[in-house]
């Protein structure tokens, strides 16, 4: 079986302040089972942006219906972007476990925020 890959097609995305940013991510397989999470930054201090499994993320919505059993599109949309949202975002696949085990990360998408047009 081909090894699962996590694909973030855009290296960078630029969005005007106040608008929404779409961060694209697809996986090449649903196996092994386990959730997808989005983070900003890397390492122990990385910030959780979205968790497929749980949590309340009022500014983040999945682009595709995550309840589809064959869904492999884990793209997200972040609303009302501010300069504080700038950074590199990573889509990370986990394998189920206690706790879940990080399996594969996308290459990252750098979000830059332009000043709001006057």
């Amino acid at each position: 079986e081909e090894e699962l890959q996590v694909i973030q097609p855009e290296k960078s995305v630029s969005v005007a302040a106040g608008e929404s940013a779409t961060l694209n991510c697809t996986a090449t397989s649903l196996i092994p089972v386990g959730p997808i999470q989005w983070f900003r930054g890397v390492g122990p201090g990385r910030e959780l942006i979205y968790h497929q499994k749980e949590g309340h993320f009022p500014r983040v919505t999945p682009v595709s219906d995550p309840t589809k059993r064959n869904n492999m599109d884990f793209s997200i949309r972040i609303s009302n972007i501010t300069p504080a949202d700038a950074g590199t975002y990573y889509c990370v696949k986990f394998r189920k476990g206690s706790p879940d085990v990080e399996l594969k990360s996308g290459a990252g998408t750098e979000l830059s925020v332009r000043a709001k047009p006057s």
Epitope: L30, I31, V33, P35, K53, E54, T67, K68, R69, N70
Partner: antibody, heavy 118, light 107 residues
Framework: DVQLVESGGGVVRPGESLRLSCAAS????????MSWVRQAPGKGLEWLAG????????YYIDSVKGRFTISRDNSKSSLYLRMNSLTAEDTAVYYC???????????WGLGTLVTVSS | ALTQPASVSANPGETVKITCSGG??????YAWYQQKSPGSAPVTVI????ERPSDIPSRFSGSASGSAATLIITGVRVEDEAVYFC???????????FGAGTTLTVL
């Protein structure tokens, strides 16, 4: 509190049709996939069909494919199961169940009894 | 198909373990459903292998490894008498399956 209330069961003759309903309350119905599960007298649980939150994707066990149809109306927070060409083997209590993020079930209705008898 | 024992029994206060086998660890998530009488509404006591809903007592726990899942009831009580069904979701086939059920008798 999450509540799921099935209705539409009853006694029908072999070959007839029936439509079951499940009224949901206490949660955002349009955010959850849903399923139908049945239990024949003295038997175990049998999953029949599932539907994604948006209603575009449906899934069935092979034995009811083409004969049963799952659907939903998010504006009414309602789930449905249309059952055609019923046989005595379809006699069971039919439950609707809310799906977790990974397609297991976290809440169940009280069930509605369908009896197929001549 | 998921396989579980037909029955188990225990004295109050003992620890009960019910196993469920037959799923592939890498493609299957497990859950445990409690049914106190035939035809009554099942209650989910564990889902996602080891996650306990907030209204379920902490004496219920779950685990999964290899091709099996286990429901553990630590300090079993008389009110835990029920049939316990293991359930699985297979990410390869998109299908839900159930075991035949285990009748727990608390002596």
């Amino acid at each position: 509190d999450v509540q799921l209330v099935e209705s539409g069961g009853g006694v029908v003759r072999p070959g007839e049709s029936l439509r079951l309903s499940c009224a949901a309350s206490g949660f955002t119905f349009s955010s959850h996939a849903m399923s139908w599960v049945r239990q024949a007298p003295g038997k175990g649980l049998e999953w029949l069909a599932g539907i994604s939150a948006g209603g575009s994707d449906t899934y069935y066990i092979d034995s009811v494919k083409g004969r049963f149809t799952i659907s939903r109306d998010n504006s009414k927070s309602s789930l449905y199961l249309r059952m055609n060409s019923l046989t005595a083997e379809d006699t069971a209590v039919y439950y609707c169940a809310r799906e977790t993020w990974n397609h297991l079930f976290d809440y169940w209705g009280l069930g509605t009894l369908v009896t197929v008898s001549s | 198909a998921l396989t579980q024992p037909a029955s188990v029994s225990a004295n109050p206060g003992e620890t009960v373990k019910i196993t469920c086998s037959g799923g592939d660890y890498y493609s299957t998530y497990y859950a445990w459903y409690q049914q106190k009488s035939p035809g009554s509404a099942p209650v989910t006591v564990i889902h996602s292998d080891d996650e306990r809903p907030s209204d379920i007592p902490s004496r219920f726990s779950g685990s999964a490894s290899g091709s099996a899942a286990t429901l553990i009831i630590t300090g079993v009580r008389v009110e835990d008498e029920a049939v316990y069904f293991c359930g699985g979701y297979d990410g390869r086939t998109y299908i839900n399956t159930f075991g035949a059920g285990t009748t727990l008798t608390v002596l």
